[in-house]
């Protein structure tokens, strides 16, 4: 339901100092400037709601312009413990410690936080991305090496008067950015401790955080141009659905992806796109300024609402799911990559979704809010939307219960 309760001090209003504090682009992530140590060392840090470690490059790497030098910080404390984080592809490993951390364009506070000093990595840092570390904003349950390592945001809330909430406005440019343009461009805003009304239009609609590990939510229905995909809603959340600023694409479970692509293909059948386009391998291009946005459908995800049997929908445009790409070989054209892809780990609402909306991570009330972003890319005919309420029954059945594999927690 919409957020119409009385204003609470410090929770909403204007956060001028934090507006426009993000840079980057959806393909390589959005980052915020942070300082670590004493004297402060400035680093650009990827904002990632899909993980829970604060980890920074702490050794030379070919893709890093700078890195955290622990030996130069008088406030660094070694925890004498290693951390190893493998991904499906790639990994990083490092040494745990704590140090003083602040966000120059954030709340005027300094906190002592856990820091993983990355000493070795593979397929983690991105050449040309301009960030040197990652700020995992999710919950302790998925922190490495285990849930006893307090995430940065928990430390921030515990040690200061900052309310337990943050909000993100990620602004896709709508056109490709070269390196110098990224450095000069505005990428969006991370409002720590509140909601800034200037960053969205219309009302905020909230969906419950199903479980505090990832920012897990429940999708109850999917539509392509208003046509229901008509799948068992469990499929949409198999094995989970999360909101993840550190992922570029909208990633969908295999069955859902196949159904969605079939429907998007059918809706856009006036043009014949190569199979490689739907796989994310081939670009499609049009003469500059002639992209036929109208032939591509809108995509609506219905999310569980805060009230029983009530849902709301968020609708994205092709301007969100076709990602502009610069390729010198085809520079006279506007070229795009299909930014919806297949997942084996559930639905991931990445930058493709988030660039359409102002997203409020209201940890205090265990909910995530969505409103139409004031910076989303659209055309004169269609706009991204957040609409409700809709009546949806048996929404609890849409959640998938991951089988418990840890014997210590099995009932005997």
């Amino acid at each position: 339901e919409t957020d119409e309760e009385p204003e609470e001090p410090g929770r909403r209003g204007s956060f001028v100092e934090m507006v426009d504090n993000l840079r980057g682009k959806s393909g390589q992530g959005y980052y915020v400037e942070m300082t670590v140590g004493s004297p402060p060392q400035t680093l650009n840090i990827l904002v990632d709601t899909g993980s829970s470690n604060f980890a920074v490059g702490a050794a030379p790497h070919p893709f890093l312009h700078r890195y955290y030098q622990r030996q130069l910080s008088s406030t660094y404390r070694d925890l004498r413990k290693g951390v190893y984080v493998p991904y499906t592809q790639g990994k990083w490993e490092g040494e745990l410690g704590t140090d003083l951390v602040s966000i120059p364009h954030g709340p005027n506070v300094t906190v002592r936080a856990n820091i993983a000093a990355i000493t070795e990595s593979d397929k983690f840092f991105i050449n040309g991305s301009n960030w040197e570390g990652i700020l995992g904003l999710a919950y302790a349950e998925i922190a490495r090496p285990d849930d006893s390592l307090e995430p940065f945001f928990d430390s921030l809330v515990k040690q200061t008067h900052v309310p337990n909430l943050f909000s993100l406005q990620l602004c896709g440019a709508g056109f490709p950015l070269n390196q110098s343009e990224v450095l000069a461009s505005v990428g969006g805003s991370m409002i720590i401790g509140g909601i800034d009304h200037s960053l969205y239009t219309g009302s905020l609609w909230y969906t419950p955080i199903r479980r505090e590990w990832y920012y897990e939510v429940i999708i109850v229905r999917v539509e392509i141009n208003g046509q229901d995909l008509k799948m068992d809603c469990k499929e949409y959340n198999y094995d989970k659905s999360i909101v993840d600023s550190g992922t570029t694409n909208l990633r969908l479970p295999k069955k859902v992806f196949e159904a969605a692509v079939k429907s998007i293909k059918a809706a856009s059948s006036t043009e014949k796109f190569p199979d490689g386009f739907w796989l994310g391998e081939q670009l499609v291009c049009w003469q500059a300024g002639t992209t036929p946005w109208n032939i591509f459908p809108v995509i609506s995800l219905y999310l569980m609402g805060e009230v029983t049997n009530q849902s709301f929908r968020i609708t994205i445009l092709p301007q969100q799911y076709l990602r502009p790409v610069e390729d010198v070989a085809t520079s006279q054209d506007d070229c795009y990559k299909f930014a919806i892809s297949q997942s084996s780990t559930g639905t991931v609402m990445g930058a493709v979704i988030m660039e359409g909306f102002y997203v409020v991570f209201d940890r205090a009330r265990k909910r995530i809010g969505f409103a139409v972003s004031a910076c989303h890319v659209h055309d004169e005919f269609r706009t991204a939307a957040v609409e409700g309420p809709f009546v949806t029954l048996d929404m609890e059945d849409c959640g998938y219960n991951i089988p418990q594999t840890d014997e210590s927690t099995l009932m005997t």
Partner: antibody
Framework: EVQLQQSGAELVRPGTSVKLSCKAS?????SYWIHWVKQRPGQGLEW???????????KYNQKFKDKATLTVDTSSSTTYMHLSSLTSEDSAVYYC?????????WGQRTLVTVSA | DIVMTQSQKFMSKSVGDTVSVTCKAS??????VAWYQQKSGQSPKSLIY???HRYSGVPDRFTGSGSGTDFTLTISNVQSEDLADYFC?????????FGGGTRLEIK
Amino acid sequence: EVQLQQSGAELVRPGTSVKLSCKASGYTFTSYWIHWVKQRPGQGLEWIGMIDPSDSYTKYNQKFKDKATLTVDTSSSTTYMHLSSLTSEDSAVYYCARSGVAFPYWGQRTLVTVSA
Amino acid sequence: DIVMTQSQKFMSKSVGDTVSVTCKASQDVGRNVAWYQQKSGQSPKSLIYSASHRYSGVPDRFTGSGSGTDFTLTISNVQSEDLADYFCQQYNSYPYTFGGGTRLEIK
């Protein structure tokens, strides 16, 4: 400037294997797939397969799925093609090429000669 | 697999002429066809994508046309440096396939 630098010519014995490399520069390596193409003397071009450097996902031409294995090392922006159980039929020029729309960029060629 | 047929293996033209190289797909590939030029001992060079779009830096003497199953590469005002093999490629579906090539000789 986008460049694909391939490894040098190989003279190999029948029944053995060979690993060719293709080092990319001038663009964000993980943003574009890399393809491999075979050309036998005086013949046309055959697509072997492709790899997505962002997650190592591969797709092969059925004809080459037991012959070629594609891998990637993002730390060095290099793609590899391993060719196994070599016969005279595998004597050819091999190219890597980068995705975009079709194959806008090609490597400079690697000649593989299989001979006893 | 989609078969791309270039029926003319050789073509001979004089400098200044116009030449049309044709390519036929065994099934509808939309406009998802590219053309490449390969000079002796060199790698293929990309000329045309999406049937009719020139890659950056390709002279406008090279034009592509066609859709569905029939495609043409036209080279107007042929120059001596155009001596090469020309290949079409469909990238509509996997496996990607190439035509057998057409060799342009200069009289």
